[in-house]
Amino acid sequence: TLNSVLINSNAIKNLPPPLGGAGGQPGSAVSVAPGVLYEGGNKYQTLDNYQPYPCAEDEECGSDEYCSSPSRGAAGVGGVQICLACRKRRKRCMRHAMCCPGNYCKNGICMPSDHSHFPRGEIEESIIENLGNDHNAAAGDGYPRRTTLTSKIYHTKGQEGSVCLRSSDCAAGLCCARHFWSKICKPVLKEGQVCTKHKRKGSHGLEIFQRCYCGEGLACRIQKDHHQASNSSRLHTCQRH
């Protein structure tokens, strides 16, 4: 039989979010995710060796990354997708999240946007990603399968705290962000709120309690009075463009 009853134990770590399925519970509020990175103590710290961060959707990646298969030809290898570096101005794209911050995808090319043209996860031409049943499945061309919005029309949007798979599962003003045990609907960040800027490739791999992205018209930038601070402690907040 499995262990008999446990008697003592040091506080061992592990787990996270709240639940609620797609519908959630009205009023089941969730904090704007602390965005805590693994730190010292007996808490998990960094991953032993950085490996490419697996993902199922763009929201799981840093603001300067998007989720796709490593190469167009690699899609067949288990259908695994990872976070890839965003595409700069004038590079080819299929959706907004592929373009670096300050750009958006227009006619298949990353173009500069004067304001935050499309917040991360927003829909281009009423098309959304649909990963189907397999979280990691990718279409044969190395990009997630896509389907028109009509397939989601009757889907109840998750309230704050509802478990979700992607931001389109959440109500307006919320994004789907990791909260360790699962991903939940959390508020999109407002002006002045602390945000996460992934400077080092792969740093998002440590972010178990993930923050949403900054709301429309806002960018995640170093807070002015923190310019003097050391690189590691610089505080980023959502600021007007």
Epitope: A11, I12, K13, N14, L15, P16, P17, P18, L19, G20, G21, A22, Q25, G27, S28, A29, V30, S31, P34, G41, K43, Y44, P54, A56, L131, N133, D134, H135, N136, G161, V163, L165, R178, H179, F180, W181, S182, K183, I208, F209
Partner: antibody, heavy 112, light 112 residues
Amino acid sequence: EVQLVQSGAEVKKPGASVKVSCKASGYTFTDYYIHWVRQAPGQGLEWMGWIHSNSGATTYAQKFQARVTMSRDTSSSTAYMELSRLESDDTAMYFCSREDYWGQGTLVTVSS
Amino acid sequence: QSVLTQPPSVSGAPGQRVTISCTGSSSNIGAGYDVHWYQQLPGTAPKLLIYGYSNRPSGVPDRFSGSKSGASASLAITGLRPDDEADYYCQSYDNSLSSYVFGGGTQLTVLS
């Protein structure tokens, strides 16, 4: 250092209620959920529900919906799980979890 | 019976490789909800081994690895050691139950 310290073992009679506490320290209590998970002797883990420490919003597993009440006191950074109408098969180790940390467990024995 | 199905026991000699399966359905693992793996040594709270299918917290040796295929997940342990003897649980979320769910647990025996 993040710690979740639970109250001591309890022995209860069938039909009674038990209230287990979980005192958090080393982090901002109101930023996280507290989950409760139980484990009967020789059995697996069973999720009971969660409370959001800031808002007090709760979600309970259907099995416990009618008997469990989760609450918190933000001033003392403590979460509580009360289980009523106890039966002998509620004898288990009850864990609180901050999602990435677990308490040491509280053994609740229900016996006449 | 658990929503996530694990073999009750597996065994292997020191140095060998063992795998523990966790079979779910289209409402949990197959729907794309994360799978996490825990190790529970006798008399202790569960300890996280793998999160989000295949990520290892620091301090967890690379002998432990996780993978996912369709509605199933697997935990592989290579270079088996006597101190790996423990119970192992998978965990996910089930949208039909609106609940977090655990596998029934697998007891790993390291043969001497």
